[in-house]
């Protein structure tokens, strides 16, 4: 066992001589991003105060390529890197094409309306005028490609002109535009060369030891890894913690059960019911508030102040009133819950599917004409699954070196 342990320790650390170094650097596991849109069926009726009705469309599947660059080994047992992602549409795996049209809430208009709710009426009437002049409406009919990667909108230029630096988009607005061909921030993680117990744990993100998006030290902490590998020798008592730049927070997954993936023993980690619970149900989450119903997390503080919410798809594990407020939602544990299957000895993921939903809080705001008589509602925009499974040569090498060899050495 000590020999096996030595073999594992030697091969999991972030070091060019390590067996898993290239796997860490390039991630040979094919990742796929599957996006499901909520097509709004009754936009005119919603403006009149009726209940929203949506139809799930998709999946629209993209192959996700990841590579680390600017890899710099520091002298405090850490390594810094930028990880870039690019996405390539996969027509054969998709149910539809990127030119499919989807009716969606106009995030810029309805988001701005909620943000302006407590501002002076004159300012809200200016907004009405501006939206009118620019031809902006509460709902828009855009292609999948436009929603994902960006569409030209005069409002983007207007926001950038009058509120410089507030908005991460330059001339196009797209929900995934920031992710394509760009990095997710500078991660500095422990290599495990000197101290294996800290391997993969994040030391800093963008030079920060903690973020300032939230209202408590606990919620602002950068805990766990960067979400790709974890320290070895896990037990059922272990938790899977990682910092997600997209959610602007650390997340903790819990052990659920043991399993086997392609002959490799795994531990399945899943989201606890408390992940997106509000502060009144789970006090440690109070720092993420102000909260609406439980089961959705307000990410406005790190998403240009827009009233955007993160949750499980179809409001799974959330307050039932959320799913009941929108016709066409059907939360389902099997289809909508996330999981990561980890090889406990090495802390390397074998098979995973991280599923999250993005929603917009919208309502009628007095004086912003475009909001009509919309009843307050958290309306799902889309949900996505980021999935990957080890396969082929990588799987064979992994199985041989880290499962078969230790077994042989054991005997």
């Amino acid at each position: 066992p000590s020999l096996i342990k030595q073999q594992v320790l030697k091969n999991v650390r972030i070091d060019p001589s390590s067996l898993s170094f290239n796997m860490w650097k390039e991630i040979p596991i094919p990742f796929y991003l599957s996006v499901y849109f909520f097509d709004v069926m009754n936009p005119s009726e919603i403006l009149k105060g009726e209940k929203p009705q949506v139809r799930e469309r998709g999946p629209y599947v993209y192959r996700e390529f990841r590579h680390k660059s600017n890899i710099t080994f520091n002298n405090n047992d850490t390594v810094s890197f930028l990880e870039y992602r690019t996405f390539q549409f996969q027509p054969s795996k998709s149910h539809g094409s990127e030119s499919d049209y989807i009716v969606m809430p106009n995030i810029l208009v309805l988001g701005a309306a909620v943000m302006m709710e407590n501002k002076p009426m004159t300012l809200k009437l200016i907004m009405t005028l501006a939206f009118t002049t620019l031809g902006e409406r509460a709902f828009m009919n855009r292609t999948v490609g436009e929603i994902m990667w960006g569409y030209k909108d005069p409002l983007v230029n207007l926001i950038n002109k009058y509120f410089p630096g507030m908005f991460p988009f330059k001339d196009k607005f797209g929900l995934f535009a920031e992710l394509n061909n760009s990095d997710s921030g500078l991660f500095t993680v422990f290599t495990g060369v000197q101290n294996i117990s800290r391997i993969h744990l994040v030391d800093k993100w963008n030079g920060l030891s903690k973020v300032d998006f939230w209202h408590s030290d606990q919620c602002n902490m950068i805990n766990g890894t960067s979400g790709q590998m974890w320290p070895p020798f896990m037990t059922p008592e272990s938790s899977l913690e990682f910092y997600s730049p997209e959610a602007c927070r650390s997340m903790k997954l819990m052990y659920k059960e043991s399993g086997v993936f392609e002959g490799i023993p795994t531990y399945r980690f899943v989201a606890p019911k408390t992940l997106f619970a509000n502060g009144s149900i789970y006090p440690p989450n109070e720092g993420f508030c102000p909260c609406l119903e439980s089961g959705i997390q307000n990410v406005s503080t790190c998403r240009f102040s827009a009233p955007l919410f993160l949750s499980h798809p179809h409001f799974l594990n959330a307050d039932p009133v959320l799913a009941e407020a929108v016709t066409g939602l059907h939360p389902n544990q099997e289809a909508h819950s996330l999981f990561l299957d980890i090889h406990p000895v090495t802390g390397i993921p074998m098979n995973c599917s991280v599923k999250l939903q993005l929603s917009l809080y919208m309502k009628s705001v007095a004086g912003i004409g475009q909001t009509g008589k919309i009843e307050p509602v958290v309306l799902p925009l889309l949900w996505f699954a980021e999935s990957g499974a080890m396969e082929g040569e990588t799987l064979h090498t992994f199985y041989t070196q880290l499962v078969l060899m230790p077994k042989v050495m054991h005997y």
């Epitope: 009426m121 004159t122 009405t128 009118t132 009509g372």
Partner: antibody, heavy 125, light 110 residues
Amino acid sequence: QVQLQESGPGLVKPSETLSLNCTVSGGSISSSSYYWGWIRQPPGKGLEWIGSVYYTGNTYYNPSLKSRVTMSVDTSKNQFSLKLNSVTAADTAVYYCARHVLGGGWEVSQRFDYWGRGTLVTVSS
Amino acid sequence: QSVLTQPPSASGTPGQRVTISCSGSSSNIGSNPVNWYQQLPGTAPKLLIHTNNQRPSGVPDRFSGSKSGTSASLAISGLLSEDEADYYCAAWDDSLNAYVFGTGTKVTVL
């Protein structure tokens, strides 16, 4: 030329609901440049803005009357309406409907450029 | 009780110049454009001046408006008998969150 015409009962009993309609002709109520407003004038007194409504149904009201006022739009009839509940004698007035213009650039100039002739509503038992 | 104060009356002989003042505060005239309405006896009000000094088409250039600080004024030059009416100033009030009218000034042509 835009014209507005108020219609509704001239007499309303105390504690009941005052209901008025305003029909717009010579222009579409669905024009996105305008709200449509109601203003009243008690006999021998000054003008008081009640509230305004957009073609989408979006409203904003005078806070002093907000709890009792409801305004709505019927784009198919090119009409907008006013409901004022729990009326008292103090609500006796000539009620005008008017086109509420939002003009100007970053300084919004709100103004009422076209007015109906007005209808006298008396609150009395 | 109106927050925009006007003199109750003003008068002049035909051909004279009459000025009506409208006094407000920083939350109305001080921060928003002023409009003026003319109400002839027994008729609905009519927009006379908007955005402090702009005349809608059809309004004679005898009518002019100005604004300074928290006060505004309407001037009628070359007074005519047909100018006999009630005049109201108006502006949005940021504190009250309402469109407010002045107390009204009755102009009499002597």
